[in-house]
Amino acid sequence: APVPPGEDSKDVAAPHRQPLTSSERIDKQIRYILDGISALRKETCNKSNMCESSKEALAENNLNLPKMAEKDGCFQSGFNEETCLVKIITGLLEFEVYLEYLQNRFESSEEQARAVQMSTKVLIQFLQKKAKNLDAITTPDPTTNASLLTKLQAQNQWLQDMTTHLILRSFKEFLQSSLRALRQM
């Protein structure tokens, strides 16, 4: 697994470099997680033919994965920094149970799946420092999460492969939207 942002040898070798601002750190953290997702997607695509499936076919699923909508204030039209930040943090917290599901889904990239999970936690902490209105954030209910995880793990092999693919794709899209929005803040 690649080393987390700020821990590569280049950072050690360049003590004169300015420390990263909070926005730069968040940007770097998201890009690091996206790299991890790419590696996981590579293993998934090599293992199954899910990646060739059309978006329409994959849309027929009952997963309630977090998704950016116009009302979330993260798009250029109707952009609202605080509403958007709340959406990003809430969405990342909702993704956590799906990242937990991914932990036993990889053979050669097991470490990478763990790195994505842990790096997402770090990202949430960075973003929380930036948010003014934490009261607006609803954290997932553990009881609901537990029954969701049980349900996902009870699926047949084909559905589990599809679920893995959908989680990775949705998480990638959510992070990309978040990255674009955060660059406007």
Epitope: L93, E96, E100, Q125
Partner: nanobody
Framework: AVQLVESGGGLVQAGSSLRLSCAAS????????MGWFRQPPGKVREFVGR???????NYADSVKGRFTISRDNNKNTVYLQMNRLKPEDTAVYYC????????????WGQGTQVTVSS
């Protein structure tokens, strides 16, 4: 598994305050979420509030603005600060821990009695 022990309950007058503690022992204390629940006499157990691993709190509507949950990871303890108590807050209060994102509340305390008299 984590062992949870609640303390701080008692008999108080309506309008007063009380702070409950939930001390954890056992495994390293960094659960995904810690929750407070209560069971009023003759009723089912109900959700009071929770605090997640990053410190974000959520509350039941009935206690919002009156109750506050906090945690001290150095002391392996979670607190429930209860202000402006009402007779309908009378219940046995339980704390619970969810060790991972998908585990549900997998550890529960024995409960502490809170009685609010009018």
């Amino acid at each position: 598994a984590v062992q949870l022990v609640e303390s701080g309950g008692g008999l108080v007058q309506a309008g007063s305050s009380l702070r409950l503690s939930c001390a954890a022992s056992g495994r390293t204390f960094s659960p995904y979420t810690m929750g407070w629940f209560r069971q009023p006499p003759g009723k089912v157990r109900e959700f009071v509030g929770r605090i997640n691993w990053s410190g974000i709190t959520n509350y039941a509507d009935s206690v919002k603005g009156r109750f506050t949950i906090s945690r001290d990871n150095n002391k392996n303890t979670v607190y429930l600060q209860m202000n402006r108590l009402k007779p309908e807050d009378t219940a046995v209060y339980y704390c619970a821990a969810a060790s991972r994102s998908g585990s549900g509340y997998d550890s529960w305390g024995q409960g502490t009695q809170v009685t609010v008299s009018s």
